[in-house]
């Protein structure tokens, strides 16, 4: 069964900077990736980035840069412009559309006790969904 993993990481040098890393574990070719925050795609989440393997990548504030890390993983850099840190308690969700498997989504967030530079563990379950 395909799996999606999500890691949320606070940058050690920039406490207002976060990076979301997501990957797809499974066969098939990825046709589109969407990264949302505040909940899963279509369930209250707001899309922050859309990545297509050949057409390009798009992101919207507070996302700074979306990029493919490998053929099956992506990263999204976020800049927290506010004085407080809303990202610390936010859920980020990554949805991978692949052929012929369909869509798979998983969510993750920064653990409350995270030290800068440490990552949240991969969280492929409880919001793993196949459309």
């Amino acid at each position: 069964t395909p799996e999606v993993w999500v890691q949320v990481q606070m940058e050690a040098t920039e406490l207002s900077s976060f990076t979301v890393h997501c990957g797809f574990l499974g066969p098939g070719s990825i046709s589109l990736v969407t990264v949302s925050w505040g909940g899963p795609d279509g369930a209250g989440g707001t899309k922050l980035a859309v990545l297509h393997p050949e057409l390009g990548t798009r992101q919207w504030a507070p996302a700074r840069q979306a990029r493919w890390e490998t053929q099956s993983s992506i990263s999204l850099a976020l800049e927290d412009s506010g004085a407080s840190s809303p990202f610390a308690n936010t859920t980020f969700c990554c949805k991978f559309a692949s052929f012929p498997e369909g869509s798979w989504e998983s969510c993750g967030s920064l653990p409350p006790s995270s030290d800068p530079g440490l990552s949240a563990p991969p969280t492929p379950v409880p919001i793993l969904r196949a459309d």
Epitope: S36, T46, V50, L55, G56, W60, Q71
Partner: antibody
Framework: EVQLQQSGPEVVKPGASVRISCKAS????????INWVKQSHGKSLEWIGD????????NYNQKFKGKATLTVDKSSGTAFMGLRSLTSEDSAVYYC???????WGQGTTLTVSS | DIVMTQSPSSLNVSAGEKVTMSCKSS????????????LAWYQQKPGQPPKLLIY???TRESGVPDRFTGSGSGTDFILTISSVQAEDLALYYC?????????FGGGTKLEIK
């Protein structure tokens, strides 16, 4: 297949503002993320910016910051581009296109003339 | 901003001929992570909006005839039409799909003798 229907031609006076619309009817969410592109007469294409219907957030080409304002009404699937302080340099055909430019509207001709 | 330079600015060919047009970018359009080139080609016929022909430098959009072929990597790209047809009369633009602002080349005008 997605259809992008743009509003009709506009003739406006210098200094005025205008708002162009682009209604998307599609079946995937990417059909509602809209780019705007300018094509001056006999010239190439210039990307103005794009708008995200989830957040109403927009990305702009620095050249068009302060000139264009991009918004979207998610409920109706309509994107809007406002252009302010118009001059003859703004006379052009303006296109809307889907997120990765795979579908385009028919274009809206803007003429700025006194 | 990434500058896209197309050449030649115009081509005048007979039906059935093979044509090539060039597009050069001022920065690499290759994404090192997935080894894909974010370069697109568009065809614009008179009085019509542009139409996506090729993306990822070499992938034909659905419905595009196989006489259209995209090639190249990094900063140098080519669009080839293997056997030009009368209906190919159009302007052809390349576009940087790699990074904002998504700049277009100046275009190559294809005219049929």
């Amino acid at each position: 297949e997605v259809q992008l229907q743009q509003s009709g031609p506009e003739v406006v006076k210098p200094g005025a503002s205008v708002r162009i619309s682009c209604k998307a009817s599609g079946n995937t969410f990417t059909d509602f993320f809209i780019n705007w592109v300018k094509q001056s007469h006999g010239k190439s294409l210039e990307w103005i910016g794009d708008v995200n219907p989830d957040s109403n957030g927009a990305n702009y080409n620095q050249k068009f910051k302060g000139k264009a304002t991009l918004t979207v009404d998610k409920s109706s699937g309509t994107a809007f581009m406002g252009l302010r302080s118009l001059t003859s340099e703004d006379s052009a055909v303006y296109y809307c296109a889907t997120l990765f430019f795979d579908n385009w509207g028919q274009g809206t001709t803007l003429t700025v003339s006194s | 901003d990434i500058v896209m330079t197309q050449s030649p600015s115009s081509l005048n060919v007979s039906a059935g001929e093979k044509v090539t047009m060039s597009c050069k970018s001022s920065q690499s359009l290759l994404n090192s992570g997935n080894q894909k080139n974010y370069l697109a080609w568009y065809q614009q016929k008179p009085g019509q909006p542009p139409k996506l022909l090729i993306y990822g430098a070499s992938t034909r959009e659905s419905g595009v005839p196989d006489r259209f072929t995209g090639s190249g990597s990094g900063t140098d790209f080519i669009l080839t039409i293997s056997s030009v047809q009368a209906e190919d009369l159009a302007l052809y633009y390349c576009q940087n799909a790699h990074s904002s602002p998504y700049t277009f080349g100046g275009g190559t005008k294809l005219e049929i003798k």
